[in-house]
């Protein structure tokens, strides 16, 4: 029920991630740490360096009060999961300073991956027989 | 905007292999999941497949010996093939993008495609 | 499979009503629904998702409620062009399951 919850959090996510995607110009043109094919089993601990990254407005123009509405959105914690526990425990994830810094627009894709990775295999993990690759 | 469009023969013989594909325009094919969807004439709708930007899939188990789904980047395009249809498999043939893994947020408007001798 | 089951299969309303459509799972799905809106001919149109998450770009008359296995679609105020088949999908566990549609026509 709790990875359920924390899982379709993830999927509203993906939207507000989508609607960055729209103001990327108007996002300050910061390099930030931004995982990419993460291991398994690290996908909590990527996501908190996805929600720990400084995704900032450049305070431009008339989009500025959605942007921080937005990036607010996207830093809200969700309650910890025995899977994020356990995983804060691996001390072999890489930390997010050892990430690849890119700039926003890449950023929010990879931002997105992930969290599409971390549905998947929930969705996967409730079935049995439709996996193909 | 992301926008679909089916391309394919209308009309298959039985026996044969259906063939689509689904061009994406106003978007990259190089995120998210890509999926057929298809809707016999009366009839509601049924999951076939997806594939994901990687090239993973996933497919409905009552047609998985049948189809494949695959992706081509380069053209910002993906593919459905369905072999050895009969009758049954007569319907409308909708391409759509889950960008939320689980849900379709964009639809082509579909294609019919008849099986028939 | 997990199999929906939307009800009414059709309802005749006219423009101003307030129109509920229910869809009920086989098993617990949590909030894992979608609702798609269809017109003949045209692409279908995402609705809502997880239940209540209503999607970028569609009206606010249109709300999705429930979890486990009861859900509602609510049109709070039928406009003409909401004239359409409304389906339902799970979205809980592979194979991904429509429900069977319902109907919105003018009364």
């Known amino acids: 029920q709790g990875q359920d919850r924390h899982m379709i959090r993830m999927r509203q996510l993906i939207d507000i991630v989508d609607q960055l995607k729209n103001y990327v110009n108007d996002l300050v043109p910061e390099f930030l740490p931004a995982p990419e094919d993460v291991e398994t089993n690290c996908e909590w601990s990527a996501f908190s360096c996805f929600q720990k990254a400084q995704l900032k407005s450049a305070n431009t123009g008339n989009n500025e009060r959605i942007i921080n509405v937005s990036i607010k959105k996207l830093k809200r914690k969700p309650p910890s999961t025995n899977a994020g526990r356990r995983q804060k425990h691996r001390l072999t994830c890489p930390s997010c300073d050892s990430y690849e810094k890119k700039p926003p627009k890449e950023f929010l894709e990879r931002f997105k991956s992930l969290l599409q990775k971390m549905i998947h295999q929930h969705l996967s993990s409730r079935t049995h027989g439709s996996e193909d690759s | 905007q992301v926008q679909l469009q089916e391309s394919g023969p209308g009309l298959v013989k039985p026996s044969e292999t259906l063939s689509l594909t689904c061009t994406v325009s106003?978007?990259?094919?190089?995120?998210?999941?890509w999926g057929w969807i298809r809707q016999p004439p009366g009839k509601g709708l049924e999951w076939i497949g997806y594939i994901s930007s990687s090239g993973s899939t996933n497919y409905n188990p009552s047609l998985k010996s049948r189809v494949t789904i695959s992706v081509d980047t380069s053209r910002n395009q993906f593919s459905l093939k369905l072999s050895s249809v009969t009758a049954a498999d007569t319907a409308v043939y909708y391409c759509?993008?889950?960008?939320?893994?689980?849900?379709?947020?964009?639809w082509g408007q579909g294609t019919l495609v008849t099986v028939s001798s | 499979d997990i199999q929906l089951t939307q009800s009414p299969s059709s309802v005749s309303a006219s423009v101003g009503d307030r129109v509920t459509i229910t869809c009920r799972a086989s098993q617990g799905i949590s909030s894992w629904l979608a609702w798609y809106q269809h017109k003949p001919g045209k692409a279908p149109k995402l609705l809502i998702y997880?239940?209540?998450s209503l999607q970028s770009g569609v009206p606010s008359r249109f709300s999705g409620s429930g979890s486990g296995t009861d859900f509602t679609l609510t049109i709070s105020s039928l406009q003409p062009e909401d004239f359409a088949t409304y389906y339902c999908?799970?979205?809980?566990?592979?194979?991904?399951?429509f429900g069977g549609g319902t109907k919105v026509e003018i009364k």
């Open positions: 997880v239940a209540s």
């Open positions: 759509a993008r889950s960008a939320g893994v689980a849900d379709f947020d964009a």
């Open positions: 999908q799970q979205a809980s566990s592979f194979p991904l399951t």
């Open positions: 106003g978007g990259s094919i190089s995120s998210d999941y």
